[in-house]
Interface confidence: medium
């Protein structure tokens, strides 16, 4: 969980309706998949499916679950303890110093270079140089048959593999 | 430089298919998702799909599926548009375009002109 | 589906009037982990195809005249033409890349 919470990544929601669990808050916290009440006595469940909290906590509202985008898939829906996993499409991947963007991947690798390492959700291939078997850090989009230009538009945090 | 060039206009009759292709030049389509949006004279525009020609997958949107199909041919550098048992309110101009990894179009083609008669 | 409504749907100007027009989303473009709007704009000039102008509901496409700018949050979005040119008379649309693109029904701008 995200230590930076925003007003935006909180649900807010209805006082307690019946259906949701109360439960008295142990020193001041409540547990995972629970928030607390505004007066601090009790400890009001997370809706399934709408937000969740995946560490004990003083928050006053759940955090709302994530979307994944139109170019990820679901790999596990959100529950009440944790948030929604996405994942890049196939043939995409999202980068660790931009765990936001899922950008196409390579698919070749430049020339005088041979490829090591197949395209991942977590990673672009990877290519060594031939002779030495050095990585290649960089991208390089141009593939070795075809005389390319490097597409344009930046990749996206929206819908990110479109 | 960056060009999609689409065949010309297709005069087809009700009930008929037709195959409507996309050639890109100046990048490899393996690299890039290529789209398809469909635009009817004083109307809006319609995306039908895309598809990721270095792995053939394609998604579409819902009113178009099974109605349209997305191909590719990456040795020709070719993607194709091919609609099935066509009627009226098929025809429209259609545009190919590129997106990297967006759902933005920054390239488009010129269009293909798609007229259906009875 | 996400239902993009534009306003007006034509507008006459004179050349050097600044222009706004307005794009409405029917849910949030705001990606809550991003913190970017998945909204973008095109224009179309008659008989031509759409050019990007604006993506990330701000963020100029290189090549596009800074007399264009998007702004927004959310789901209510502006494009504003700071001094209209001749040669900006075309059809403006909207799009959204949240979820399965849409687009809006387009603004026409016309010369008075």
């Known amino acids: 969980e995200s230590a930076l919470i925003t007003q935006q990544d909180l649900a807010p929601q209805q006082r307690a309706a019946p259906q949701q669990k109360r439960s008295s808050p142990s020193e001041g916290l409540c547990p995972p998949g629970h928030h607390i009440s505004e007066d601090g006595r009790d400890c009001i469940s997370c809706k399934y499916g709408q937000d969740y909290s995946t560490h004990w906590n003083d928050l006053l509202f759940c955090l709302r679950c994530t979307r994944c985008d139109s170019g990820e898939v679901e790999l596990s829906p959100c529950t009440t303890t944790r948030n929604t996993v996405c994942q890049c499409e196939e043939g995409t991947f999202r980068e660790e110093d931009s765990p936001e963007m899922c950008r196409k991947c390579r698919t070749g690798c430049p020339r005088g270079m041979v490829k090591v390492g197949d395209c991942t959700p977590w990673s672009d291939i990877e290519c060594v140089h031939k002779e030495s078997g050095t990585k290649h850090s960089g991208e390089v989009p141009a593939v070795e048959e075809t005389v390319t230009s490097s597409p344009g538009t930046p990749a996206s945090p929206c819908s990110l593999s479109g | 430089e960056v060009q999609l060039q689409q065949s010309g206009a297709e005069p087809v009759k009700s009930g008929a298919s037709v195959k409507l292709s996309c050639t890109a030049s100046g990048f490899n389509i393996k690299d890039t998702f290529i789209h398809w949006v469909k635009q009817r004279p004083e109307q809006g525009l319609e995306w039908i799909g895309r598809i990721d020609p270095a792995n053939g997958n394609t998604k579409y949107d819902p009113k178009f599926q099974g109605k349209a199909t997305i191909t590719a041919d990456t040795s020709s550098n070719t993607v194709y548009l091919q609609f099935s048992s066509l009627t009226s309110e098929d025809a429209a101009v259609y545009y190919c375009?590129?997106?990297?990894?967006?759902?933005?179009?920054?390239?488009w083609g010129q269009g293909s002109t798609l007229t259906v008669s009875s | 589906d996400i239902v993009m409504t534009q306003s007006p749907s034509s507008l006459a100007v004179s050349a050097g009037e600044r222009v706004t027009m307005s794009c409405k989303s029917s849910?949030?473009?705001?990606?809550?982990?991003?913190?970017?709007?998945?909204l973008a704009w095109y224009q179309q000039k008659p008989g031509q195809f759409p050019k990007l102008l604006i993506y990330w509901a701000s963020t100029r496409e290189s090549g596009v005249p800074d007399r264009f700018t998007g702004s927004g949050s959310g789901t209510d979005f502006t494009l504003t033409i700071s001094s209209v040119q001749a040669e900006d008379l075309a059809v403006y649309y909207c799009?959204?890349?949240?979820?399965?693109?849409?687009f809006g029904g387009g603004t026409k701008l016309e010369l008075k």
């Open positions: 799009q959204q890349s949240f979820d399965l693109p849409t």
């Open positions: 849910q949030s473009l705001l990606n809550s982990r991003t913190r970017k709007n998945c």
């Open positions: 375009s590129r997106g990297t990894t967006v759902y933005y179009f920054d390239h």
